[in-house]
């Protein structure tokens, strides 16, 4: 059985403009640290999609270290008590409350770098992360709604006469499946307990001059295209798996 062919120009494309994939850090350059910071910095929240199994670095507001009293990271993950990592500059002391995930750590010593790192991002790291910089002039916050992205496994096969099935298995968020040319399609979604979604699109082409069909899977982690030849052989089951 022949494998479905990838369209290389589309397969796993990543664009530098794609906020989700451009970088695993949203940190500012040290030169941008504000010495006369303004209340504009007081509360910033960012939605940040991050690919699973990558490393992520989350940053505090750009406040000069000499103005700091305390740095705190509050981490709220689904189904877990709020974890707090705090550093008190005066005593060079760190404290942790309810923090059990050893992959979530300070990047280095907090007195040198207030950033937080997640090593090998997992689905369980989905949640809200907030840095609180306590200064004499008030508290300055930067929050991240971290959305962990899981690349779906894509398969394409023909299961009946002039009917093809394209599946994007266990993606996060759900992938979007489209076909060229368009056919008579039905799409179903299956939700898994770990937050991933399997999308299955079944299409039938009545028109006999359609011999090759392409399944295009769009996802935040990148796009994939596969094509398959429709063989009108009764009982034939042509199968292919993405490589």
């Amino acid at each position: 059985e022949g494998a479905a062919q990838p369209n290389n120009s589309l397969m796993l494309q990543t664009s530098k403009e794609n906020h989700a994939l451009a970088s695993s850090s949203l940190c500012m350059d040290e030169k941008q640290i504000t010495q006369n910071y303004s209340k504009v910095l007081a509360e910033v929240n960012t939605s940040w999609p991050v690919k699973m199994a990558t490393n992520a670095v989350l940053c505090c507001p750009p406040i000069a270290l000499r103005n700091l009293i305390i740095i705190t990271w509050e981490i709220i993950l689904r189904g877990q008590p709020s974890c707090t990592k705090a550093y008190k500059k005066e005593t060079n002391e760190t404290k942790e409350t309810n923090c059990t995930d050893e992959r979530i750590t300070w990047v280095s010593r907090p007195d040198q770098n207030s950033d937080l790192q997640i090593r090998t991002v997992a689905i369980t790291h989905d949640g809200y992360y907030r840095c609180i910089m306590v200064t004499p002039d008030g508290n300055f916050h930067r929050g991240y709604h971290l959305q962990v992205l899981v690349t779906p496994e894509v398969t394409l096969f023909q299961n009946r006469n002039r009917t093809a099935v394209c599946k994007a298995v266990a993606g996060k968020p759900a992938a979007h499946i489209s076909w060229i040319p368009e056919g008579d399609c039905a799409t179903k979604q299956e939700y898994w307990s770990n937050g991933t979604v399997t999308v299955k699109s079944t299409c039938h082409w009545e028109v006999h001059n359609v011999s090759t069909v392409t399944c295009h899977v769009s996802h935040l982690t990148g796009n994939k295209s596969l094509y398959i030849e429709l063989l009108p052989v009764p009982g034939a089951k042509k199968s292919a798996k993405l490589y």
Epitope: I69, I70, T72, T84, A86, K88, K89, E90, T91, E93, K95, T97, I132, V134, T135, P136, D137, G138, N139
Partner: antibody, heavy 124, light 107 residues
Framework: EIQLQESGPGLVKPSQSLSLTCSVT?????????WSWIRKFPGNKMEWMGY???????VYNPSLNSRISITRDTAKNQFFLQLNSVTTEDTATYHC?????????????????WGPGTMVTVSS | DVRMTQSPSNLAASPGESVSINCKAS??????LAWYQQKPGKANRLLIC???TLQSGTPSRFSGSGFGTDFTLTIRNLEPEDFGLYYC?????????FGSGTKLEIK
């Protein structure tokens, strides 16, 4: 039991400096906690002025930043307030106080021990 | 700065009654509010911290509630020694700020 007691002149002339002492007994100020000055104006309004930490670092209310200095004498277990260029608006009862410490140190800036306060009038 | 608005300024009640004092913050201070009692010639007394945590030695007739911007101190079954001046204080951020005070008097 920790006790705090304020002392200093009850009358200060405008444009001069106000200097107060807080004497602490029952605890060594270099062993822990933050040690604050708080004042209560006529009419009952309260203002936190600043603190000196047990390591000697200071944090001041930005509204007083240019005029305030909090220092200490570890040998005498005392800490001090100096407020420069006073005006009649600085007339108040001045309290020293000790911060509380919980299991986490980010939100523990409230006060479980206070001095009774010393009244300071600024007048010519 | 976080402005703390306390109400009422004055309150008169009789022993055995219940009273409530309110404190409103100009911005979200989460749960980080303390309540104090002041009496003439005595050191200020910390009653409650973190919105609802009773300080050791605070009688159980005192209770604190609220979150974000709106907080309440409730005293049930007033005792004669409960009369005095009450203050709220936010301990969420610097500069630390206080309410304007509530004078609780015997009716």
């Amino acid at each position: 039991e920790i006790q705090l007691q304020e002392s200093g002149p009850g009358l200060v002339k405008p444009s001069q400096s106000l200097s107060l002492t807080c004497s602490v007994t029952g605890f060594t100020i270099t062993s822990g906690y933050d040690w604050s000055w708080i004042r209560k104006f006529p009419g009952n309004k309260m203002e936190w002025m600043g603190y000196i930490g047990f390591s000697g670092s200071t944090v001041y209310n930005p509204s007083l930043n240019s005029r305030i200095s909090i220092t200490r004498d570890t040998a005498k277990n005392q800490f001090f307030l100096q407020l420069n260029s006073v005006t009649t608006e600085d007339t108040a009862t001045y309290h020293c106080a000790k911060s509380f410490v919980q299991n986490t140190f980010i939100y523990d800036w409230f006060f479980d021990f206070w001095g009774p306060g010393t009244m300071v009038t600024v007048s010519s | 700065d976080v402005r703390m608005t306390q109400s009422p300024s004055n309150l008169a009640a009789s022993p055995g009654e219940s009273v409530s004092i309110n404190c409103k913050a100009s911005k979200n201070i989460s749960k980080y509010l303390a309540w104090y009692q002041q009496k003439p010639g005595k050191a200020n007394r910390l009653l409650i911290c973190s919105g609802s945590t009773l300080q050791s030695g605070t009688p159980s007739r005192f209770s604190g509630s609220g979150f974000g911007t709106d907080f309440t101190l409730t005293i049930r079954n007033l005792e004669p020694e409960d009369f005095g001046l009450y203050y709220c204080q936010q301990h969420n951020e610097f500069p630390l700020t206080f309410g304007s005070g509530t004078k609780l008097e015997i009716k």
